[in-house]
Interface confidence: low
């Protein structure tokens, strides 16, 4: 969460002289309350935009727009504080619109915009517009808040941004999974145009309960240049227990731009549908005997395991 680096932050418009300033997120009207305070914003609109930095990087930004109510309180409106809170980290960034001239009613509703908050893919933010001065402690609130979820790197607009591209967003592995005879599963996917290793992770679950009953990891060594964009195949021997039949396959690349933090792609294979005529297996076969875990490597990013923003389901 940061401000776009190079844009001159402008808030002036016809009929209003205005300047944008960095804010500590604590306007002094909290400390020096004013008796007469403006009403809250009428509407806040937030959408995603993509902007280029002065270094030519494409970054996702929040486009925030709000309008004023058409009441006399605009005569006491001295500016606005925009606050963006990243919900998973509690990180907050604020800017202040400082009005250098008095607002007057004119023929159309006053509208303000700001598009300089740089955000991260797959993160949720709370955007608050606070009119200034803020109200006295028991006064009516004069702010409005809205939450906004920034799409992940699978989203078409996000794919081409620098944070997504450096996480491997342009790679589409087009994973296919095929069940073979003799408890085997063949996973195929398309290699990217970089000589980088891949890891294919298989985790199997019982159909009735979400219990992991089998876990194996296979390495694919870095392909040669002539193998770029070709299909790679990995065959897994599955658990011998027929109830361990719900498979989650994940392909993790190790592109040099993101190493262990690259976007992973996953597919899920459900258990086969068993018809009513199927003869049930002996009960003993249902006892969840845990298979040994195998194939771990120093590439395994344990604190990412199960964190949904790394797993892209197709």
């Amino acid at each position: 969460l940061r401000l776009l680096d190079h844009r001159a932050l402008v808030c002036s418009q016809p009929g209003l002289n205005c300047t944008v300033k960095n804010s500590t997120c604590l306007d002094d009207s909290w400390i020096h309350p004013r008796n007469l305070t403006p009403s809250s914003p009428k509407n806040i609109y937030i959408n995603l935009s993509v902007s280029s930095t002065q270094h030519g990087e494409l970054v996702p930004v929040l486009h925030v727009e709000w309008t004023l109510q058409t009441d006399a309180s605009i005569l006491y409106l001295e500016g606005a504080e925009l606050s963006v809170l990243q919900l998973n980290t509690n990180e907050r960034l604020c800017v202040r619109f400082e009005f250098l001239s008095k607002l007057r009613h004119h023929h159309r509703r006053w509208r303000f915009t700001f598009s300089h908050f740089v955000v991260d893919p797959d993160q949720e933010y709370e955007v608050t517009v606070h009119h200034l001065p803020k109200p006295i402690p028991d006064g009516d609130p004069n702010h409005q808040s809205k939450n906004f979820l920034v799409p992940d790197c699978e989203h078409a607009r996000m794919k081409v941004t620098t944070p997504c591209m450096s996480s491997g967003s342009l790679w589409d592995p087009n994973i296919t999974v095929e069940t073979l005879e003799a408890h085997q599963l063949r996973v195929s996917f398309t290699l990217w145009n970089e000589s980088t290793p891949y890891q294919v992770l298989l985790e199997s679950f019982s159909d009735s309960e979400n219990h992991s009953c089998f876990d194996v990891v296979k390495q694919i060594f870095a392909p040669r240049q002539e193998e770029f964009h070709q299909r790679a195949n990995v065959t897994f021997t599955l658990s011998k227990f027929h109830w361990c039949c719900h498979h989650h396959v994940q392909v993790q690349p190790f592109f040099s731009s993101c190493l262990n933090d690259c976007l992973r792609h996953a597919v899920t294979v459900p258990c086969p549908v068993i018809s009513n005529t199927t003869v049930p297996k002996p009960v003993a076969d249902y006892i969840p005997l845990w298979e040994p875990r195998s194939g771990s490597s120093d590439y395994k990013d344990d604190d990412d395991k199960g964190s949904s923003h790394h797993h892209h389901h197709h």
Epitope: F221, S256, S257, C258, D261, D298, D303
Partner: antibody, heavy 118, light 107 residues
Framework: EVQLVESGGGLVQPGGSLRLSCAAS????????MNWVRQAPGKGLEWVSF????????YYADSVKGRFTISRDNAKNSLYLQMNSLRDEDTAVYYC???????????WGQGTTVTVSS | DIQMTQSPSSLSASVGDRVTITCRAS??????LAWYQQKPGKFPELLIY???TLQSGVPSRFSGSGSGTDFTLTISSLQPEDVATYYC?????????FGPGTKVDIK
């Protein structure tokens, strides 16, 4: 301009601590893994530590494991190396370096000098 | 851990000479190898990555080759400004070890 600037080096006694900082500018710091590399006087380059973009993966050279801690603050575009229980052999110029898309490290700081001596 | 060795440890050559430095990994590292040039009192600069890809801005007299365990850095025609120490580095997985370096100077 893409830039890395190290700071925090200095003279410290054996057993003491120092915290090095690396300020990044000119690129989207939060998208890149980062490394610390050091060079003892008259010696070769020694890789010290690695931290991934979201701090989910951290590696250390055996020579510093348990004594050094790498961290980062993406909001401040900063990389850190906390060095405890310093030894004479930790005397070196410490560089922060950014990995290149495709391999290697293409952006290096000018380095900060750490001298461990009684 | 994989060890990186370089040979020779130092060499002297005349301006215009073809210079070859070798780097060997104790186990295969595919093409996960970079070469750096470090001039006295300066920070290292990336010359070659992915064993053979020239970093932008690096003169074309520098080239790299090899895969697996054996790698070569070649300067096709040595220039006075090439006086430096050259390091190889593996980056397939941690530790991202450097070779001990090869010091190149002019006869």
């Amino acid at each position: 301009e893409v830039q890395l600037v190290e700071s925090g080096g200095g003279l410290v006694q054996p057993g003491g601590s120092l915290r090095l900082s690396c300020a990044a500018s000119g690129f989207t710091f939060s998208s890149y893994s980062m490394n610390w590399v050091r060079q003892a006087p008259g010696k070769g380059l020694e890789w010290v530590s690695f931290i991934s973009a979201r701090s989910s993966t951290i590696y250390y050279a055996d020579s510093v494991k348990g004594r050094f801690t790498i961290s980062r603050d993406n909001a401040k575009n900063s990389l850190y190396l906390q060095m405890n229980s310093l030894r004479d052999e930790d005397t070196a110029v410490y560089y922060c370096a950014r990995p290149k898309v495709g391999g290697g490290m293409d952006v290096w700081g000018q380095g900060t000098t750490v001298t461990v001596s009684s | 851990d994989i060890q990186m060795t370089q040979s020779p440890s130092s060499l002297s050559a005349s301006v215009g000479d073809r210079v070859t430095i070798t780097c060997r990994a104790s186990q295969g590292i595919s093409n996960y190898l970079a070469w750096y040039q470090q001039k006295p009192g300066k920070f290292p600069e990336l010359l070659i990555y992915a064993a053979s890809t020239l970093q932008s801005g690096v003169p074309s007299r520098f080239s790299g080759s090899g895969s697996g365990t054996d790698f070569t850095l070649t300067i096709s025609s040595l220039q006075p400004e090439d006086v430096a120490t050259y390091y190889c580095q593996k980056y397939n997985r941690a530790p991202f070890t450097f070779g001990p370096g090869t010091k190149v100077d002019i006869k």
